[in-house]
């Protein structure tokens, strides 16, 4: 049994880091493998993560962690029984993938303006809370070419757009994701999408 692709890990900068790797053949990750991880500080002990399968030869492990600080460094040991398959380390603050925003809502009752709001996925005492910016993706269910991205570079988790910038009388979907420039994070996953019917009063044309 060998590791084909070494574990790579990302942290949500809150309580979970996710590590993924590939073995050289089909593996029952949860029965055959264990990932031990230990914070490199005095009195810390190793914790065990039981991996799950992620495709035939792929494994994924969700590591429980404390609130992350930039000084945190973990040793990682991947074991198959008594055999050490791989040894490495991981600094959560250097590999951050934010949590996905939630509760995306489209408010259509504001005179010909669409107001999209969502929730910041972090509590106020988390460092990322005040450092997230967002991308909102809006697309038409009827027309695959009608696909747009709005970058929200301010901190408020909301976006206002004129309803008239979208076609009237058809259904749209929206989703949102986040990233934090300060830690050069990757983008979060997209939030679940929400659907609405776009309708607005066409301006009266005078001839």
């Amino acid at each position: 049994m060998k590791v084909l692709q070494e574990p790579t890990c990302v942290s949500d900068y809150m309580s979970i880091s996710t590590c993924e790797w590939k073995m050289n053949g089909p593996t029952n990750c949860s029965t055959e493998l264990r990932l031990l991880y230990q914070l490199v500080f005095l009195l810390s002990e190793a914790h065990t993560c039981i991996p799950e399968n992620n495709g035939g030869a792929g494994c994924v492990c969700h590591l429980l962690m404390d609130d992350v600080v930039s000084a945190d460094n973990y040793t990682l040991d991947l074991w198959a029984g008594q055999q050490l398959l791989w040894k490495g380390s991981f600094k959560p603050s250097e590999h951050v993938k934010p949590r996905a925003p939630g509760n995306l809502t489209v408010h259509t009752n504001v005179s010909d303006t669409l107001l999209l709001t969502w929730s910041n996925p972090y509590p106020p005492d988390n460092y990322l809370y005040n450092h997230l910016t967002y991308a909102v993706n809006i697309w038409s269910e009827n027309d695959p070419a009608d696909f747009r991205i709005y970058n929200v570079t301010y901190l408020e988790p909301s976006l206002r757009i004129a309803a008239s910038t979208l076609k009237s009388g058809i259904s749209y979907r929206a989703r949102v994701r986040a990233w934090a420039q300060c830690y050069n994070t990757t983008w979060s996953e997209w939030s679940p999408s929400t659907k609405w019917h776009n309708s607005y009063r066409e301006p009266f044309e005078q001839h």
């Epitope: 500080f41 005095l42 009195l43 002990e45 429980l64 600080v69 000084a71 945190d72 460094n73």
Partner: antibody, heavy 117, light 112 residues
């Protein structure tokens, strides 16, 4: 909210024994090392002992090895300190504390041990 | 054992003024990546100690930002930018490099 509540202190004669307890709540007890720190009346803080999250590793300041024993019961979320061969100079408030990144992130309110005849 | 030495022993302060406490260790508490194995604690009168600063310069949750930690190697400093009446108590530094964990003797901060 993390809570640590010590108990078991009291008046004991020199040479006597006492068992202190610390009930923990608000966090996953088995994931953390925990320590005992004491403070004699009008004096500074003194680290006594620590135990790893699983209970497999214990640590003591030299002056307490052999007389004091730290233990934990993760099923009861409780930390213990057995004090034997007590002396007058062991009179102190004994605090339990949750360890993280080497230091003490949360403290109990303390329990007073008085050694006197 | 690592010996921790704090100064001054007592520090009378005026509210609104800055204050500074020094802590020296008998061996270096710094590691390669620029982090320092030193914590600061405050014990207010009649209370348990509380963590203020960890790893030399990281402010603990809920601690006002007027508290800051700095230093490296064997010399460390706790600064209070503007002292408030609620800051009175005894301040301790502690090394977290090795067991036994050792504290400084404490600095008593009191209002003038």
């Amino acid at each position: 909210e993390v809570q640590l509540v010590e108990s078991g202190g009291g008046l004991v004669q020199p040479g006597g024994s006492l068992r202190l307890s610390c009930a923990a709540s608000g966090f996953t007890f088995s994931r953390y090392a925990v320590s005992w720190v004491r403070q004699a009346p009008g004096k500074g803080l003194e680290w006594v002992s620590a135990i790893g999250g699983s209970g497999g590793k214990t640590y003591y300041a030299d002056s307490f090895k052999g007389r004091f024993t730290i233990s934990r019961d993760n099923s009861k979320n409780t930390l213990y300190l057995q004090l034997n061969s007590l002396r007058a100079e062991d009179t102190a408030v004994y605090y339990c504390a949750r360890n993280l990144r080497g230091g003490f992130w949360d403290w109990g309110q303390g329990t007073l041990v008085t050694v006197s005849s | 054992d690592i010996v921790m030495t704090q100064s001054p022993l007592s520090l009378p302060v005026t509210p609104g003024e800055p204050a500074s406490i020094s802590c020296k260790s008998s061996q270096s508490l710094s590691e390669g990546q620029g982090y320092h194995r030193l914590d600061w604690y405050l014990q207010k009168p009649g209370q348990s100690p509380q963590l203020l600063i960890y790893l030399g310069s990281f402010t603990a949750k809920g601690v006002p930002d007027r508290f800051s930690g700095s230093g490296s190697g064997t010399d460390f400093t706790l600064k209070i930018s503007r002292v408030e009446a609620e800051d009175v108590g005894i301040y301790y530094c502690m090394q977290t490099l090795q067991t036994p964990l050792t504290f400084g003797g404490g600095t008593k901060v009191e209002i003038k």
